[in-house]
């Protein structure tokens, strides 16, 4: 039994069969910049007089405005089948989330099962190393953090175009530099199953002591 079935309470509607959205695809996994289409559908028997339009929601918030959705109606002698189509062109990471449909039937709100949309792409930096001025031969730290999906994201550190660590570290990564005698440029490489993203290069300057 589908838990989304409405609990009708009025005397006239007690005999109405339960209505619920059909089960969804479940989980869509795709790469950034691809197009995606999905739908939810519901069969409304003729015995139901009052139905409102289908609205699309993502992560608990209604999707309004520029989103591309179409609702199709297929009537037959028993009622009407309604299919709500949703499409996203050139998906971005911000399109990640749980999508679902809502509609009102006989003044009762019905919610579909979610469709999980997982957009995968190259690692995305949320923390990159920053330029600092350091005292000669004094230890300092640099931080690099990148995320997927897909996870995990592995980090290589680069100093003056040469890799510092032979084995990658899982993001987030902190590089402890024991000290420098001259200016150097540091960056980090973030790797996941989709490929490689390189951070900005940062100059670490040696403070001149007067």
């Amino acid at each position: 039994a589908h838990t989304a079935a409405p609990q009708v309470t009025s005397t006239a509607s007690k005999l109405l069969p339960p209505v619920a959205f059909n089960h969804t695809i479940g989980h869509i996994v795709l790469s950034e910049h691809k197009n995606v289409k999905f739908n939810c559908s519901i069969n409304i028997p003729n015995t139901y007089q009052e139905t409102a339009g289908i609205s699309w929601w993502k992560d608990g918030k209604e999707l309004l405005g520029a989103h591309h959705s179409i609702t199709q109606f297929y009537p037959d002698e028993e009622g009407v089948s309604i299919i709500a189509l949703f499409s996203i062109a050139s998906v971005q990471r911000s399109d990640n989330g749980s999508y679902f449909c809502k509609m009102k039937v006989n003044n009762r709100e019905i919610v579909s099962d979610p469709i999980y949309v997982e957009v995968q792409g190259l690692p995305y930096f949320i923390k990159q190393p920053e330029s600092v001025n350091v005292t000669r031969n004094t230890a300092f730290n640099l931080t690099c953090q990148a995320v997927g999906p897909p996870e995990p994201v592995n980090i290589f550190w680069v100093q003056n175009s040469s890799r510092v660590n032979e084995k990658p570290e899982r993001s987030p990564s902190v590089l402890t530099v024991p000290g420098l005698t001259e200016t150097a440029v540091f960056s980090c490489e973030a790797h996941n199953d989709k490929g490689l993203t390189v951070s900005k290069g940062v100059h670490i300057n040696i403070k001149v002591i007067p």
């Epitope: 695809i25 479940g26 989980h27 869509i28 989330g97 899982r170 993001s171 987030p172």
Partner: antibody, heavy 116, light 110 residues
């Protein structure tokens, strides 16, 4: 990214126990977390899930027996009134997304023993 | 809650061989199914999600298929390191139907 459970110990039946999961390298405001247990020599058993905004979902058998809550870096599983059947290794695991209950990072588990 | 039924409970195969594990859901779960590998004394490891997507670092010898109520995990070119117990798990609308695991399948490699 890592998760680690703590707080497993020997308790007597009926004594509430809280097991804690500490996470690092990711944010609980982005990812959901699940709890799964495994009795000695048995299979995996799903207990429940807390999503990124704090909504909790439980397996039917677990409702009322367990409570899941979280802070910014920890997720707690409270066993409200343990019985000997609750003796198991308890795992916490990171969900694939905010509301997605497949688990891509698991802790090593913590053993809870309920005995007189 | 959805109930997941996994078969067989145990299977034995030779190195280089192929093993097929089946998982049946008590109702349609779309493709919201994951497979895990667990070795004795270790934590489970995600192998496959969304029924057929390989998790990071998992060799392509592992393959998942199916949708709706019937799912399959196939391990080809078996290696000794594949000896483990394998579990399926639904995460379809986990807020409504739970995240039940199958009973597990022990794979013995000869």
């Amino acid at each position: 990214q890592s998760v680690e459970e703590s707080g497993g110990r020997l308790v007597t039946p009926g004594t509430p126990l809280t097991v804690t999961c500490t996470v690092s390298g990711f944010s609980l405001s982005v990812y959901g977390m699940g709890w799964v247990r495994q009795a000695p020599g048995k299979g995996l058993e799903y207990i429940g899930f807390i999503n990124n905004v704090g909504n909790t979902y439980y397996a039917s058998w677990a409702k009322g027996r367990f409570t899941i809550s979280k802070t910014s870096t920890t997720v707690d599983l409270k066993i409200t009134s343990p019985t000997t059947e609750d003796t198991a290794t308890y795992f916490c695991a990171k969900g694939g997304g905010g509301d997605w209950g497949y688990f891509n990072i698991w802790g090593p588990g913590t053993l809870v023993t309920v005995s007189l | 809650d959805v109930v997941m039924t996994q078969t067989p409970a145990s299977v034995e195969a030779a190195v280089g061989g192929t093993v097929t594990i089946k998982c049946q859901a008590s109702q349609s779960i779309g493709n919201a199914l994951a497979w895990y590998q667990q070795k004795p004394g270790q934590r489970p490891k995600l192998l496959i999600y969304a029924a057929s997507n390989l998790a990071s670092g998992v060799p392509s010898r592992f393959a998942g298929s199916g949708s709706g109520t019937q799912f399959t995990l196939t391990i080809s070119d078996l290696e000794c390191a594949d000896a483990a117990t394998y579990y399926c798990q639904t995460y379809y609308a986990i807020n409504r139907y739970g995240g039940a695991f199958g009973g597990g399948t022990e794979v013995v490699v000869k």
